[in-house]
Structure formats: structure tokens, C-alpha cells
């Protein structure tokens, strides 16, 4: 047998060489077309396992879009035809709760999760006899990477004199549940940086195949939480990085989500974008925002893909994406996942399993309506999956998809065998579909969530609610004391109330100046490299949030450290959630908060509010009877009609759907 090259096994402490045996038909020599289903016999540690594989239909589509750039920096859009892709998922015969994510493109490569061990398999280089290396994932050498600063590092920091023991915490009741009842769909967009592209020999096809493989691995990990990963886009920075990647992980993450909001969202709708970087951050494997998966401005993460295998890298991306999905680190909590360490452990452990805590954190996100964007099954033109009736994704050419024949028995509107609507059905799913019929125009389908949001209504001829819009960023709110920012009125009192209860309010400005000038974990203007930044006096109102009149202590499933600083006759309260430096701190002042006359917080600096590009003269444009929405169209008050609120009508905008139903005035909001 061929011996593996040093490069191939240098990261393994133990491995075996095996020859998988294909059960279904003779092993093909030609790489395409790939079978929809295939089975192999695989040997591992003296045992033979029969594995059954099925092409992962939910993963990728007809119009898989890949964005690249030419030498002039012009965006190129490509739709490579990869319907008959070679990425599979499956199970090990006779092994309860087993799962497999493999590609069968040029030999078998991927992950096998058995009851108490995970194995990696890959083709043996230069073998002409279909030989493969199989190894336990525990036997892969890994650099001691962490998701930012580990919790222990934070605890080691010098205790502050002012720090107080918080009042006793109410323990949240824990319900152990591995799988949440309703399937959620994460529409994932991956961006690959220039250095990683160069590292892959500037081979766009190789990058694309590797990222599809990664998405397949992610899907195999998330399925235990009843979450499906659907890759909706890939962008490769072939001509140079489009953001500044100099600085700390926090700086790069901030730059990336700003670029995403400005350039990527408009091109391709998605729930979370993950940047894949070659450059490391001194032991930090990645960084992401917590609970922001549906946010326009913060649904992103960065992930370091250096000299590690894609199998190991998958657990890093699963971890950072987990943060977006509301999952905190497992460290210091009573969590179990049936393995030595779990995916949301702060040290990048290469684990494949989510813990009970992760399931609970994600459930909390969904209960708090933070995961509403995950309910939609990706539309046919948005999902990169080879169309297949029965995968519960409405693919191109399908009108509905109710899943398996058993599931379809419960669906009155969809013909399971054809994925077409039954003849009497107008629709089968969607916020504006009820009992197989379109809800009447004027039915509220997405209510107003704050004074900076606007409602949306069904239009009477579609199963979908109108796209979500809100009041244009920069519009005054809270009696001119604040500005609207991404659908929320951002002001200090409200932020204090979220953390410290309904009686709390912002502390005086002196508190912010005194605490945030210190540059420690309780008072800072962000994180750069390995240290906290002190706030200049002019930026102090954009650092750590300072509150007073605190009567409740927060419980977010993770016990925070609370600091109380006496200042000029009051007590300033601040909080550190100790989430690790791979997670932006929810105890900081929110972006978009008004920090002075005509000024807002951005990137922990108090800058001119003109950066919000608010350009709506409501008197001229909306005749004083409405406001501009995020599409820069008038949303009229009840009594006035769009588009310009000039004539009598029933309110709303060209974007909101009709606010009124002639037949049924009870539908008015």
C-alpha cells in the first residue's frame, strides 16, 4: 500500500489506512454523475461499519451564485452548474444517533459521528487503490486556539475595588431538550478573503468546493438542534480584501459587518454572513456577535482558517455562527453534550456536538423573537440546493414542499408527491397563508415593534408578508432625545432598562467619563489587539453603558459581573457579561445612540449624525403626514394615502402592503 506523505498525517497522532468498499453498483471511475444514494463498508478500529449516504439536497441549487472580482475590481457574478454535486449526509447502520457528512467527489472525505466518537476520513494521497486514511477527531493535533480571550483569562484580571457581589440570581429553569420542535433555516453567506484564496492556489473551483464541503459539515452539526444550514451565497475576494483586516479581531469584525450591511445585503438576502480569513489574531480562532442572526447590521462573524483541516475549521464556524444564533460559551455552566467538550466551549476544541445549554440559548432567542428570519424556508431562487421534492425546501419549479409522505399527510394544501399545490389551494405556507388561502389584503402580518418601526400587511394576492422595512435611520424619536437606528429608538434609558429592569435609567455623564476613561473590562471604548481602549472624554458616552436606579439584576442564562462605581452622589452601574473577547459586549452603549447634539455612537466613537445619511424632509416629501422608511418612501399616517401622503387614505406606504380591506374594516391595525 502507498504510505501517506508526511504533510497528510503530520497533524495526526494516530490513524489507519483502509479501503472503503462500495455496496451499491460497481465503484465508478468517472466522477460524474454522482448517485443520489450510495452505501459503503468502512473499517474503523477493527470494526466494519455500513454507511448509508444520500445527496444533501437541502444544501445547494440551480443558481448557486459565486461573486468574484476581476483585475479592475469589477464584481463578477457566476452561476456554476452544480446540481449533481457530490456532497452527502447519512448515518451508520445500526448505530443510534449516528450522523455522517461526506463528500464523494474524488474519494471519500468527511466526518462520521458515532455514539461516542467522531472520525475523519480522507483519500490517501497518491493511492491508486481507493485507499483512505481514517482517524479519530480526538487524534488531530490542534493549536490551542480560543474564541477570543477564554473565560479563565477574564477571571484572572485584577478584581476591582468597586466590584460588588450581585444580589442572589434567580436560576432559570432548565428544560433539557436536544431538538427544538420547529425546523429553522439559516441562510448562510460565506465570504473568503484574498489571503485564503491565495493559499488555495488562486483556484476558485477549489475554494468553492471547500466552502460547500464546509456548509455540509455545518449542516450535519446543526441538524441535532433541528436547524438546517442552507448556503445561499459565496463571495471570494479574488482581487484584494474589501475591508481593512489590520488590527484586532474586534476591529475586523466591525469592518466586516459594516461592509456586509452596505454592500452584501442588497445583493443577496441572507441571515448570517461569515468571513473566512487566513490571518490569525494571536490565538483567537474567531469572533461574532451574540443573538444578532436576523440583524441588518450585526449578523456576522469572522473565522480564522489557517493551517488546519476543513473538518477542524467547521467547528470554529459552527461556534461563531452559534454566537449569532444566541448561544453563549458553555464554560462555567451546567452543560452536557455527550462528549468531552462541546461546540460552544470557549476553547476551539474541534467538537461536533452542541450542548444542552446551546439548545436552551437558541430556544431563548426564538422565544424572544430574535430568530424570526429563520422561519422562512428559503425561496427557490435563494437556496443553493439541487432541487428535490421532499426536502422541505421550496426549490425552483416547486410550489410547496411538505417533506416526507408521512409529514405530507398532515398538510392539507400541498401535494406531497409532486410538490405542487392541491387544486383548491391558493398557497401552502407563508405569513399570509391560512387554511390554504391568501389572507385578505390589509391583514397585519408584521406588527410595529418600536416607535422606529412600521407595520407590514398582506397584499391579498401573495402568501408572503411584505419585506420588512422600518423608519429611516436618523429620524428623531423619543421626543427628539434620540435617533431611529435599524428600527429601534436608541437611547440610554431603554438600554439600561433592558439590562437592569424597568426602573433603571442612564447615569449622569460624569459616570460615563469617570468609568470609561479607565480602559479596563468595566470601562472602555472597545478592544484593540489584546487590550481595552480608554475612552477619550468626547467618546465616553459611547463606551460601557452606565446606569442608575438599579433595582433588578439581569439574568440572561449567563451570570454577569456587575460593577458599581460611586460618583458625585450617585451609584453608576455597569455590567460585564464575560462572554469572552470573541463576542461583542452587550453591556456597551448601542450603535446609533445619540451622544450629543447632532451626534451618534459608532464604533465606540461619538461622531456626526450625518454618517447615517438621513435625507428626508417629511414636510416636503410626505406633506407632513408621514415619515420616510428605510427604502426612502413615505409611510403615511392613518387618514392619508401613499405614495406622498397628499390625498385622503388609510395610511401605509408603497412597501407596506394595503393597510385596509374594503370588505372587512375589522382588519385595520
Amino acid at each position: 500500500a502507498a504510505r501517506p506523505g508526511f504533510q497528510q498525517t503530520s497533524h495526526l497522532s494516530s490513524y489507519e489506512i483502509i479501503t472503503p468498499w462500495r455496496l451499491t453498483r460497481e465503484r465508478r471511475e468517472a466522477p460524474r454523475p454522482y448517485s443520489k444514494q450510495v452505501s459503503y463498508v468502512i473499517q474503523a478500529e477493527g470494526k466494519e461499519h455500513i454507511i448509508h449516504l444520500e445527496r444533501n439536497k437541502d444544501l445547494l441549487p440551480e443558481d448557486f451564485v459565486v461573486y468574484t472580482y476581476n483585475k479592475e475590481g469589477t464584481l463578477i457574478t457566476d452561476h456554476p452548474n452544480i446540481q449533481n454535486h457530490c456532497h452527502y449526509r447519512g448515518y451508520v447502520e445500526g448505530v443510534h444517533n449516528s450522523s455522517i457528512a461526506l463528500s464523494d467527489c474524488f474519494g471519500l472525505r468527511g466526518l462520521l459521528h458515532l455514539e461516542n466518537a467522531s472520525y475523519g476520513i480522507e483519500p490517501l494521497q497518491n493511492s491508486s487503490h481507493f485507499e483512505h486514511i481514517i482517524y479519530r477527531m480526538d487524534d488531530v493535533y490542534k493549536e490551542p486556539l480560543k474564541c477570543g480571550v477564554s473565560n479563565k483569562d477574564i477571571e484572572k484580571e485584577t478584581a476591582k475595588d468597586e466590584e460588588e457581589e450581585p444580589p442572589s440570581m434567580t436560576q432559570l429553569l432548565r428544560r433539557r431538550r436536544a431538538v427544538l420542535p420547529q425546523t429553522r433555516y439559516v441562510e448562510l453567506f460565506i465570504v473568503v478573503d484574498k489571503e485564503r484564496y491565495d493559499m488555495m492556489g488562486r483556484n476558485q473551483t477549489a475554494v468553492r468546493e471547500e466552502m460547500i464541503l464546509l456548509a455540509n459539515y455545518l449542516d450535519s452539526m446543526y441538524i441535532m438542534l433541528n436547524i438546517r444550514i442552507v448556503l445561499v451565497g459565496l463571495e471570494i475576494w479574488t482581487n484584494g480584501n474589501l475591508i481593512n483586516i489590520v488590527g484586532g479581531a474586534g476591529d475586523v469584525l466591525g469592518n466586516f459587518v459594516q461592509w456586509r450591511e452596505k454592500f452584501l445585503i442588497t445583493r443577496r438576502r441572507h441571515d448570517s454572513a461569515q468571513l473566512v480569513l487566513k490571518k490569525g489574531f494571536g490565538g483567537t480562532a474567531g469572533m461574532a456577535f451574540v443573538g444578532t442572526v436576523c440583524s441588518r447590521s450585526h449578523a456576522g462573524g469572522i473565522n480564522v482558517f489557517g493551517q488546519i483541516t476543513v473538518e477542524t475549521f467547521a467547528s470554529i464556524v459552527a461556534h461563531e455562527l452559534g454566537h449569532n444564533l444566541g448561544m453563549n460559551h458553555d464554560d462555567g455552566r451546567d452543560c452536557s453534550c455527550g462528549a468531552k467538550s462541546c461546540i460552544m466551549n470557549s476553547g476551539a476544541s474541534g467538537s461536533r456536538n452542541f450542548s444542552s445549554c446551546s439548545a436552551e440559548d437558541f430556544e431563548k432567542l426564538t422565544l424572544n423573537k430574535g430568530g424570526n428570519c429563520l422561519l422562512n424556508i428559503p425561496k427557490p431562487d435563494e437556496a443553493y440546493s439541487a432541487p428535490s421534492c421532499g426536502n422541505k425546501l421550496v426549490d425552483a419549479g416547486e410550489e410547496c414542499d411538505c417533506g416526507t409522505p408521512k409529514e405530507c399527510e398532515l398538510d392539507p394544501c400541498c401535494e406531497g408527491s409532486t410538490c405542487k399545490l392541491k387544486s383548491f389551494a391558493e398557497c401552502a405556507y407563508g405569513d399570509c397563508c391560512k387554511d390554504c388561502r391568501f389572507l385578505p389584503g390589509g391583514t397585519l402580518c408584521r406588527g410595529k415593534t418600536s416607535e422606529c418601526d412600521v407595520p407590514e400587511y398582506c397584499n391579498g394576492s401573495s402568501q408572503f408578508c411584505q419585506p420588512d422595512v422600518f423608519i429611516q435611520n436618523g429620524y428623531p424619536c423619543q421626543n427628539n432625545k434620540a435617533y431611529c437606528y435599524n428600527g429601534m429608538c436608541q437611547y440610554y434609558d431603554a438600554q439600561c432598562q433592558v439590562i437592569f429592569g424597568s426602573k433603571a435609567k442612564a447615569a449622569p455623564k460624569d459616570c460615563f467619563i469617570e468609568v470609561n476613561s479607565k480602559g479596563d473590562r468595566f470601562g472602555n471604548c472597545g478592544f484593540s489587539g489584546n487590550e481595552y481602549k480608554k475612552c477619550a472624554t468626547g467618546n465616553a458616552l459611547c463606551g460601557k453603558l452606565q446606569c442608575e436606579n438599579v433595582q433588578e439584576i439581569p439574568v440572561f442564562g449567563i451570570v454577569p459581573a456587575i460593577i458599581q462605581t460611586p460618583s458625585r452622589g450617585t451609584k453608576c452601574w455597569g455590567v460585564d457579561f464575560q462572554l469572552g473577547s470573541d463576542v461583542p459586549d452587550p453591556g456597551m452603549v448601542n450603535e446609533g445612540t445619540k451622544c450629543g447634539a447632532g451626534k451618534i455612537c459608532r464604533n465606540f466613537q461619538c461622531v456626526d449624525a450625518s454618517v447615517l445619511n438621513y435625507d428626508c424632509d417629511v414636510q416636503k416629501k410626505c406633506h407632513g403626514h408621514g415619515v420616510c422608511n428605510s427604502n426612502k418612501n413615505c409611510h403615511c399616517e392613518n387618514g392619508w394615502a401613499p405614495p406622498n401622503c397628499e390625498t385622503k387614505g388609510y395610511g401605509g406606504s408603497v412597501d407596506s402592503g394595503p393597510t385596509y380591506n374594503e370588505m372587512n374594516t375589522a382588519l385595520r391595525d
Epitope: E399, P412, C413, K420, L421, K422, S423, F424, A425, E426, C427, A428, C436, F438, S461
Partner: nanobody, 124 residues
Framework: EVQLVESGGGLVQAGISLKLSCTAS????????MGWFRQAPGKEREFVAG????????AYTDSVKGRFTISRDNAKNTVYLQMNDVKPEDTAVWYC?????????????????WGQGTQVTVSS
């Protein structure tokens, strides 16, 4: 090839009842959805009521709910529209249509077969 023939129309006074019939011939209507449409002079054809051939599913436009009832008799290959308390605005040519595909009830292109129509005139 399925043929649909409407009957039961005519000149009636407001407030009385009327029953329209639609009889199908030339094919089986299993899994079809049968719809009644009206087209008033100078207006677009609009969906009024529908019934599934093989289930109890019925649908009505809001303006006729509680006033009209759609039913079917599979043995006679016929669909009925019972119109109570007719109003002058019900004056129109009434059409029967059949479709095998799902989608919006007012998407006329989804219907495979149409009858010739029957005139209903309601005088006040």
C-alpha cells in the same frame, strides 16, 4: 376533453333566491377545483366561490360570504351555486371553471376549462 355548461340564470328581482348549475361532461373531474366567476359589464372577471371536487373544501370571496353557498353532486357531475338575497350588483355573466393546479383564485390562466356563461340580471 371536459365541457362545462352553466344554467339557471335569468332576470330576477332583488331579494329573491337563484340557483346556478354547472354540469361537466367528457371527462373525470377527480382532484379538480371548480370555481364560479362573474363578469359585470366593463369589469374584470372575478372569483366568487369554489369547491374541491374530491373534498369538503369550499372558498368564497368576502362580499358573498353568508349569502351564497356552493355545493356539488359528484353522481350528477354538477356543481351548484345557491344565491340568496340577490342584489343589483350581482348582475353579470356567471361562468363556471375547473382547474387541476393550485394558485390564486383570481389567476384566470390557471383554469383549464371554462363554460360559455349564463346571464344573471337583478332588477331593483
Amino acid at each position: 376533453e371536459v365541457q362545462l355548461v352553466e344554467s339557471g340564470g335569468g332576470l330576477v328581482q332583488a331579494g329573491i333566491s337563484l340557483k346556478l348549475s354547472c354540469t361537466a361532461s367528457g371527462g373525470t373531474l377527480t382532484n379538480y377545483f371548480m370555481g364560479w366567476f362573474r363578469q359585470a359589464p366593463g369589469k374584470e372577471r372575478e372569483f366568487v366561490a369554489g369547491v374541491a371536487w374530491s373534498s369538503d373544501f369550499t372558498a368564497y370571496t368576502d362580499s358573498v360570504k353568508g349569502r351564497f353557498t356552493i355545493s356539488r353532486d359528484n353522481a350528477k357531475n354538477t356543481v351548484y351555486l345557491q344565491m340568496n338575497d340577490v342584489k343589483p350588483e350581482d348582475t353579470a355573466v356567471w361562468y363556471c371553471a375547473a382547474r387541476r393546479r393550485g394558485g390564486g383564485y383570481n389567476q384566470l390562466n390557471l383554469y383549464d376549462y371554462w363554460g360559455q356563461g349564463t346571464q344573471v340580471t337583478v332588477s331593483s
